[in-house]
Interface confidence: low
């Protein structure tokens, strides 16, 4: 806000004002202030604002006060010469009060020539019949941005969903550099992508690394003078491989006797990515197995023919037991029983079309 200092008579200098040799200037200030009609203290409509000198470009400081019979700048407690002021005055139609505005130009040389611990500053002083009012101090500084970052981000290899911190301390500068982060040349907006967070001290945090966060990250520092880029930090989000489930055991690879069964798994759940570790352990497991050999059945030799029966036939038989089929071996081909006609003893074969009954003897 404005600092109000009431002055009467010719006491227009503050305690911190240094006397000026510039008598010509001070003769311009009123010796006394008329007391009638009563007037309010000057009020600043616009106060001078801090300014930065970029390269060799001078800056303008500006202020406006009402009511004001006089308005001048002083810089570093010294009055600025009247001829260095650009002054304009008008009457405010609403209030009928005089509005005065003034501007001065400050060069780089003026700022550089100031010795002492304090920065170059200027303030406006406005007079009315009621006294004087001083504006706030407006500091004028030479703007710069050093080339070297105080800390640059460091590349990292991180596993999926891990938190990542990329540090950045921008180069020293006036005004203090603003920092933004680039991901592959695109500006990171944490409001748009909530997985990114930029800390108050300019570090970038990736809350949970995603595969899409594999990228080149650059810290960018900028102020009114320049824009500087840090070295690029490569973040690689890797995925360690994981095994799939085992397949079912295969059938024994030997049809007969000793062999093995196997089952397999693959490093695809997930597959390793971006240099992630390959799965540790076996991709194939084998176990011994024994398959019983198949035995094909074979016939025994035929039995003796039976005695001739009542039907005038006799028969003989054989068994599929020499050996019997086992473990999926083939069964015997052919007949178990064989029969044929016979006429032994009292058996008489009837003629094909005869109605004779056969006679049997004992």
């Amino acid at each position: 806000g404005s600092h109000h200092h009431h002055h009467h008579g010719s006491d227009y200098k503050d305690d911190d004002d240094k006397g000026s040799q510039d008598d010509e200037f001070f003769h311009e200030l009123p010796e006394t202030f008329p007391s009638d009609p009563p007037e309010p203290l000057p009020h600043f409509l616009i106060e001078p604002e801090e300014a930065y000198i970029v390269k060799n470009k001078p800056v303008n400081l500006y202020c406006k006060a009402s009511p004001a019979t006089q308005i001048y700048f002083k810089c570093n407690s010294e009055w600025v010469h009247q001829k260095d002021h650009v002054v304009d005055e008008r009457v405010d139609e609403t209030s009928g009060l005089i509005v005065r505005e003034v501007s001065i130009e400050i060069s780089r040389q003026q700022v550089e020539e100031l010795f002492g611990p304090e920065d170059y500053w200027c303030q406006c002083v406005a007079w009315s019949s009621a006294g004087t009012t001083k504006s706030r101090k407006a500091y004028v500084r030479i703007a710069y941005l050093r080339k070297t970052f105080e800390q640059e981000p460091l590349g990292k290899e991180v596993s999926l969903e891990q938190e990542v911190l990329l540090q950045c301390r921008p180069p020293e500068g006036i005004p203090v550099a603003e920092v933004e982060w680039l991901k592959n040349e695109d500006i990171i907006d944490p409001a748009e992508d909530r997985n990114f967070y930029i800390t108050i001290d300019h570090n970038l945090i990736i809350k949970q690394a995603r595969l899409s966060d594999t990228a080149n990250y650059t810290c960018v520092a900028k102020n009114i003078v320049a824009k500087r880029k840090s070295t690029t930090a490569t973040v690689i989000v890797y995925v360690n491989g994981g095994w799939s489930t085992w397949t079912e055991w295969s059938v024994c690879n030997s049809r007969c006797g000793r062999g093995y069964q196997k089952r397999t798994r693959t490093c695809t759940n997930p597959a390793p990515l971006n240099g992630g570790a390959f799965c540790e352990g076996q991709s194939v497991q084998k176990i011994a197995c024994t398959t019983l050999c198949p035995v094909d059945g074979r016939w025994t030799s035929w039995s003796k023919w039976s005695t001739c029966g009542t039907e005038c036939t006799h028969w003989r038989r054989r068994e599929c037991t020499a050996p019997a089929p086992k473990n999926g071996g083939k069964d015997c081909d052919g007949l178990v029983l064989q029969s044929k006609n016979c006429t032994d003893g009292l058996c008489m074969q009837a003629a094909p079309d005869s109605d004779d009954v056969a006679l049997y003897g004992s």
Partner: antibody, heavy 119, light 107 residues
Framework: QVQLQESGPGLVKPSETLSLTCTVS????????WSWIRQPPGKGLEWIGY???????NYNPSLKSRVTISVDTSKNQFSLKLSSVTAADTAVYYC?????????????WGQGTLVTVSS | DIQMTQSPSSLSASVGDRVTITCRAS??????LNWYQQKPGKAPKLLIY???SLQSGVPSRFSGSGSGTDFTLTISSLQPEDFATYYC?????????FGGGTKVEIK
Amino acid sequence: QVQLQESGPGLVKPSETLSLTCTVSGGSISSYFWSWIRQPPGKGLEWIGYIHNSGTTNYNPSLKSRVTISVDTSKNQFSLKLSSVTAADTAVYYCARGRGMATLPFDYWGQGTLVTVSS
Amino acid sequence: DIQMTQSPSSLSASVGDRVTITCRASQSISSYLNWYQQKPGKAPKLLIYAASSLQSGVPSRFSGSGSGTDFTLTISSLQPEDFATYYCQQSYSTPLTFGGGTKVEIK
């Protein structure tokens, strides 16, 4: 098998510049982060800085104003220069390889060379 | 800078003992922690990287654990060749920093 070998003068006068070279054999200097680390007699380890074959460097802020690390890929070498040395810079200087992007760790080290700063 | 604090600074143990060394970071470093062994007159040797991964060729009696700020190196059964100084090192951010070391001596 990767091997690193430091070389350079063992005695440097105060205010002069310490210069050391690390020769990498059994592997390429391409990729990896090549660091210098020092250890004052009877004390702990201090990282000085690293260089990548691309030329990217990163220095310990406590030494930054005095340190330069450079790389010569054609000779498979990287070098350290430390200016304006004092007795406090007396140490065994190691070169080491940082594996991975920069997550390091230092998986191969030189055997170290003692540099004494004395007039 | 991230400070790494090791404890104890030294310890005495016998062959066959189980030995535990701790390392604390001044801020969270996720799993970016490595352990080294150094014998007098020799360069450090990598034992464990990324907090718990055993470096190739290192005996399985060495193991590492921890995440965030607190980490542990354990030697399950101390062998004569294990008497040395052990250092932790963070690689979460530059400057890369080491712990002050833990000297393991014969009791």
